[in-house]
Amino acid sequence: MGCDRNCGLIAGAVIGAVLAVFGGILMPVGDMLIEKTIKREVVLEEGTTAFKNWVKTGTTVYRQFWIFDVQNPDDVAKNSSKIKVKQRGPYTYRVRYLAKENITQDPEDHTVSFVQPNGAIFEPSLSVGTEDDNFTVLNLAVAAAPHIYQNSFVQVVLNSLIKKSKSSMFQTRSLKELLWGYKDPFLSLVPYPISTTVGVFYPYNDTVDGVYKVFNGKDNISKVAIIESYKGKRNLSYWPSYCDMINGTDAASFPPFVEKSRTLRFFSSDICRSIYAVFGSEIDLKGIPVYRFVLPANAFASPLQNPDNHCFCTEKVISNNCTSYGVLDIGKCKEGKPVYISLPHFLHASPDVSEPIEGLHPNEDEHRTYLDVEPITGFTLQFAKRLQVNILVKPARKIEALKNLKRPYIVPILWLNETGTIGDEKAEMFKTQVTGKIKLLGMVEMALLGIGVVMFVAFMISYCACKSKNGK
């Protein structure tokens, strides 16, 4: 009888020990299985979870626009006063709803190439007005022409055309015209076959971004989605030195197993450069734990503050010998037009940039860019890309519309907020397929280990107690 009890207790302890060992073994084995599954599923090839979502994003992406309506156009043109602006918006468009096209796998170098078609659909229900709402904004052609043609002879010619077309420093345009293009009356007078359509995003609809060639991750998962080349080149030809490199992914996803210490590098064709994001905080997105990576102020700093940025300063006059910060001259990428990119309301920009503009209210929460990345898969499940489009306008002695200006202005035209968040259905699916399974496996591991240890300890204590009792 005593033997039976002892044997039972030892058997219980052994079972507990086996369960604990099995739970312990399951930890690295389970992690290995998860890793193997993740590595298989994030590869960009037909049949994987990643590929399906990569071809056509399952996230609804909106681009909201706020237009800077100029309140004192005549005063600025006549007296070179501060420009008073009032933002109007949001005007919302649905974007990135089109699937990638011309998808071609290259098994030789483990890459996949594609183009991303552009399209925008106005969403009246998410907007404060219609596409026909009018705004007073800088005259894009009048501001750009003397910048492109800096020679005084041509400026006299341009002045004749500007006067003839009754154009001035500012103009009134509808949202649709401003964003997507309008026939400019001044450019229409140029007696050569030039493009006379002007718009901040012209041309956009029915155009494509790319060709992109990205690593599919088949041979090396740590390279998945990283851009190998853009438009057939590994460099942009816009910037000197390393600033010209195409680094990282397109920000839609990153190689899996993202650590907080990692700097996420990505290329954005909108700003004609590669940039980076650093870990900000851990957040819960619809029950999915994600890492929020933010664009640091350092990325927009002057070379004085961040020497790495020296090659993004390509012009010495407007940048006050590279001491100004928070604006990026992307003219080289925009056919020589004086386009400057910044954060909305000149967030993180030097005071000299925003000084000539009244009515700006930079706000970190509203105006910063962030990416919410699920760390195991590297998928960006939520993002907010915020940027502002500005045009440089300078005094031009030979152009009457600009001759009264006493200083250059970097004039804000609009700012945009492009956002995407994983849908509820997709989030549930993601939880079930990825985080749910990992949680479940973790729970099983912990349960086996816990139950095993408890069983082993309990049965061993009982056995010892029993033995000492019998001994007495």
Partner: antibody
Framework: EVQLVESGGGLVQPGGSLRLSCAAS????????IHWVRQAPGKGLEWVAW????????YYADSVKGRFTISADTSKNTAYLQMNSLRAEDTAVYYC??????????WGQGTLVTVSS | DIQMTQSPSSLSASVGDRVTITCRAS??????VAWYQQKPGKAPKLLIS???SLYSGVPSRFSGSGSGTDFTLTISSLQPEDFATYYC?????????FGQGTKVEIK
């Protein structure tokens, strides 16, 4: 086809006047503006005057300022160079030429102006 | 006014030769330089604008280079019809100014 035809040249006494015409076809002078360029016998080219597009400003070489006047009649698509107080050094072949960005892509055949007593 | 100094003022060459004519501006004119060819008794003909841009219909043996103050017209292989006088011109500032010309003669 773009064509420029000058006329009005001839022999004139020092201190005299002459009006040169430049009839354009194949384009509108209003959109381009017109220049006059001259070439003294055996010498190089010298820019003389310019009328900017759409009846814009007029510009002259220092050597002719105050004596020569450039004008255009858009209805006739013709440019003119009114030359007063002519001097011996104004003797040259006068060309009218079309330009927009400052280089001359079309030239007339030229008309000879001789200033001599 | 911007002075344009051409050199040489004349040169002798044979058919098939490579010929180079230079032009120097008295101040920076960026790439706003044109080149013309003129034959006796005829109006000048545009060869090159914006320092390097070959005008339509001009044979590809003609090429232009340079930026700022120093410019060059090159004829890669001289043809019989190329014997003429060549002028550079700046189209950066009014008054527009020409070089004094380079006469290319048969050796």
């Amino acid at each position: 086809e773009v064509q420029l035809v000058e006329s009005g040249g001839g022999l004139v006494q020092p201190g005299g006047s002459l009006r040169l015409s430049c009839a354009a076809s194949g384009f509108t002078i209003d959109a381009f503006g017109i220049h006059w360029v001259r070439q003294a016998p055996g010498k190089g080219l010298e820019w003389v005057a310019w009328i900017a597009p759409y009846g814009g400003e007029t510009y002259y070489a220092d050597s002719v300022k105050g004596r020569f006047t450039i004008s255009a009649d858009t209805s006739k698509n013709t440019a003119y160079l009114q030359m007063n107080s002519l001097r011996a050094e104004d003797t040259a072949v006068y060309y009218c030429a079309r330009s927009f960005f400052g280089y001359f892509d079309y030239w007339g055949q030229g008309t000879l102006v001789t200033v001599s007593s | 006014d911007i002075q344009m100094t051409q050199s040489p003022s004349s040169l002798s060459a044979s058919v098939g030769d490579r010929v180079t004519i230079t032009c120097r501006a008295s101040q920076d004119v960026s790439n706003w330089v044109a080149w013309y060819q003129q034959k006796p008794g005829k109006a000048p003909k545009l060869l090159i604008s914006y320092a390097t841009s070959l005008y339509s219909g001009v044979p590809s043996r003609f090429s232009g280079s340079g930026s700022g103050t120093d410019f060059t017209l090159t004829i890669s292989s001289l043809q019989p019809e190329d014997f003429a006088t060549y002028y550079c011109q700046q189209h950066s500032n009014a008054p527009l100014t020409f070089g004094q010309g380079t006469k290319v003669e048969i050796k």
